[in-house]
Interface confidence: low
């Protein structure tokens, strides 16, 4: 397993609809044809897997049907979107990239993107 550099933004603010997008960029040491991208969430020293996708270079990312993630790839960049976020989902979202094929196998883990989620204020009752 060889190390690989992965870059991602330090901070992202989710939209009022609970959607956060960020770019995960990796420095590919060779010409990978198959790449796996995994988003991990770190909160209170606990790390959980949010979603994962595998794709062939130049093709769409394929997340599981019930995944909260979607994404597109362009070269060595992956544009990730996480949906359905609420305030309790605020945390550090880490991008993990694996170059699966051809060998050798490379693994890169980003420093994480702190995603802040603020639940929208409920609309006040109208007196009119």
């Amino acid at each position: 397993c060889k190390a690989m550099h992965v870059a991602q933004p330090a901070v992202v603010l989710a939209s009022s609809r609970g959607i956060a997008s960020f770019v995960c960029e990796y420095a590919s040491p060779g010409k990978a044809t198959e790449v796996r991208v995994t988003v991990l969430r770190q909160a209170d020293s606990q790390v959980t897997e949010v979603c994962a996708a595998t794709y062939m270079m130049g093709n769409e990312l394929t997340f599981l049907d019930d995944s909260i993630c979607t994404g597109t790839s362009s070269g060595n960049q992956v544009n990730l979107t996480i949906q359905g976020l609420r305030a309790m989902d605020t945390g550090l979202y880490i991008c993990k990239v694996e170059l699966m094929y051809p060998p050798p196998y490379y693994l890169g883990i980003g420093n994480g993107t702190q995603i802040y989620v603020i639940d929208p204020e409920p609309c006040p009752d109208s007196d009119f």
Epitope: T54, Y55, M56
Partner: antibody, heavy 120, light 107 residues
Framework: QITLKESGPTLVKPTQTLTLTCTFS??????????VGWIRQPPGVALEWLAL???????RFSPSLKSRLTITKDTSKNQVVLTMTNMDPVDTATYYC????????????WGQGTLVTVSS | DIQLTQSPSFLSASVGDRVTITCWAS??????LAWYQQKPGKAPKLLIY???TLQSGVPSRFSGSGSGTEFTLTISSLQPEDFATYYC?????????FGPGTKVDIK
């Protein structure tokens, strides 16, 4: 509805080359993300993954058998062909082909399998 | 290659029993594990993928769990049609290795 069917000789002699054909329907190997793999199972033994070919002609092989395996596809005929050289009695097994979609790393549809016996 | 081991290799159980099969990976494979059921003379049938996701059409008495190096397949209430051999398969990195199998037989 996805179906796959393996065909080829039931008996081959040691040192000969085995050629197996997987004929499928219900999907196309020209569709992005689609792959067809081969798995074998000696009598009473576990499954062994052999090879995979994808829509873009990307190929993967089991390292222990790579030097003996060739995998090709004929998109127009909906066929995948596996060849294994220098057959040995230990290669006696049921050979299966199976469908796989990129990003979902499992085989969701399998052929019925074909038993190949290697004996002189 | 990633090695998979299964326990037990043979299991004798009765209809209605709760059955648990364990699969260990020689290195961490996250949740990239599938479970298959195989009956004599038949091709394997996918039961569970991504360690815990039930394949469409598979009865809900089957469930999977685990992550990393240890995974389990559970049959909550064994039915007559469940007597078969069960295989785990890692799909984390090539080659996609299978476990040695667990045969579930009638007690």
């Amino acid at each position: 509805q996805i179906t796959l069917k393996e065909s080829g000789p039931t008996l081959v002699k040691p040192t000969q080359t085995l050629t197996l054909t997987c004929t499928f329907s219900g999907f196309s190997l020209s569709t992005s993300g689609v792959g067809v793999g081969w798995i074998r199972q000696p009598p009473g033994v576990a499954l062994e993954w052999l090879a995979l070919i994808y829509w873009n002609d990307d190929k993967r092989f089991s390292p222990s058998l790579k030097s003996r395996l060739t995998i090709t596809k004929d998109t127009s005929k909906n066929q995948v062909v596996l060849t294994m050289t220098n057959m040995d009695p230990v290669d006696t097994a049921t050979y299966y082909c199976a469908h796989r979609r990129l990003g979902l790393y499992y085989f969701d549809y399998w052929g019925q399998g074909t038993l190949v016996t290697v004996s002189s | 290659d990633i090695q998979l081991t299964q326990s037990p290799s043979f299991l004798s159980a009765s209809v209605g029993d709760r059955v648990t099969i364990t699969c260990w990976a020689s290195q961490g494979i996250s949740s990239y594990l599938a479970w298959y059921q195989q009956k004599p003379g038949k091709a394997p049938k996918l039961l569970i993928y991504a360690a815990s996701t039930l394949q469409s059409g598979v009865p809900s008495r089957f469930s999977g769990s685990g992550s990393g190096t240890e995974f389990t397949l559970t049959i909550s209430s064994l039915q007559p049609e469940d007597f078969a051999t069960y295989y785990c398969q890692q799909v984390h990195i090539y080659p996609f290795t299978f476990g040695p199998g667990t045969k579930v037989d009638i007690k």
